[in-house]
């Protein structure tokens, strides 16, 4: 899977999208990295 | 709203530094990359690195490395861009641009720094 | 480095038009594509990420497609302000990369 930061920031907006925001706050492409998906 | 200004155009001489900054407002900064892109006269699109504002951690393109250094200053909300040993070549429209998810989810660019290489 | 070709380079075109704009890459980048119009003088203005997703306030007339090693972007009906140039990014392998851009003149 792609692991740059864009790819992970528009994972993880997909994800919070899904979820209707419902994560934890620290929970944003600079603190989780490719892993967390 | 989400905004990014950068600092004004700048005139250096060959072999001197340069020092670009980009001012962040309408998001938390330390939540989203920052990139920065070169743009020369009538050229296309270059990506020279980004930056992680939380831990300051970065990527460069090999083309600029060990010539330029990302950096951020978390209290103001600034990222910069310092490129040195600069050659006519340098010459060109700096840009830096970040995808924030909350509040909006979009890709936003600064308006660009003209830095003009020139002895 | 991945090499993203556009084609054309040029095209000239007219209000109302159907256009299409493609991008290919040198490697598999996945759906790693964005796409963006920039207009002279002026930054960068993000169209399409994912090779297919508008981003909010883009114009249902832009549409994008693709996987793999080629994409395109479709504009369904040039309005005035869409003659400008068309870049395609991948973001799929460091260091990014962009296309050399498409130019759209009015005829």
């Known amino acids: 899977a792609c692991d740059t930061a864009t790819c992970v920031t528009h994972r993880l907006a997909g994800l919070l999208s899904r979820s209707g925001g419902v994560v934890k706050n620290n929970f944003v492409p600079t603190n989780v990295g490719s892993k967390a998906f | 709203q989400v905004q990014l200004v950068q600092s004004g155009a700048e005139v250096v001489k060959p072999g001197a530094s340069v020092k670009v900054s980009c001012k962040a407002s309408g998001y938390t900064f330390t939540d989203y990359y920052m990139n920065w892109v070169k743009q020369a006269p009538g050229q296309g699109l270059e990506w020279i690195g980004d930056?992680?504002?939380?831990?300051?951690?970065?990527h460069y393109n090999q083309k600029f490395k060990g010539r330029v250094t990302l950096t951020v200053d978390t209290s103001i909300s600034t990222a910069y861009m310092e490129l040195s040993r600069l050659r006519s070549d340098d010459t060109a429209v700096y840009y830096c641009a970040s995808i924030t998810i909350v509040p909006v989810y979009f890709d936003f660019w600064g308006q660009g720094t003209l830095v003009t290489v020139s002895s | 480095d991945i090499q993203l070709t556009q084609s054309p380079s040029f095209l000239s075109t007219s209000v109302g038009d159907r256009v299409t704009i493609t991008c290919k890459a040198s490697?598999?980048?996945?759906?790693?594509v964005a796409w963006y119009r920039q207009k002279p003088g002026k930054s960068p203005k993000a169209l399409i990420y994912s090779a297919s997703y508008r981003y909010s306030g883009v114009p249902s007339r832009f549409s994008g497609s693709g996987s793999g090693t080629e994409f395109t972007l479709t504009i369904s009906s040039l309005q005035p302000e869409d003659f400008a140039t068309y870049i395609c990014?991948?973001?799929?392998?460091?260091?990014?990369?962009f296309g050399q851009g498409t130019k759209l003149e009015i005829k």
């Open positions: 490697q598999n980048v996945g759906p790693n």
């Open positions: 990014q991948q973001y799929n392998y460091y260091p990014y990369t």
């Open positions: 930056v992680n504002p939380n831990n300051g951690g970065t």
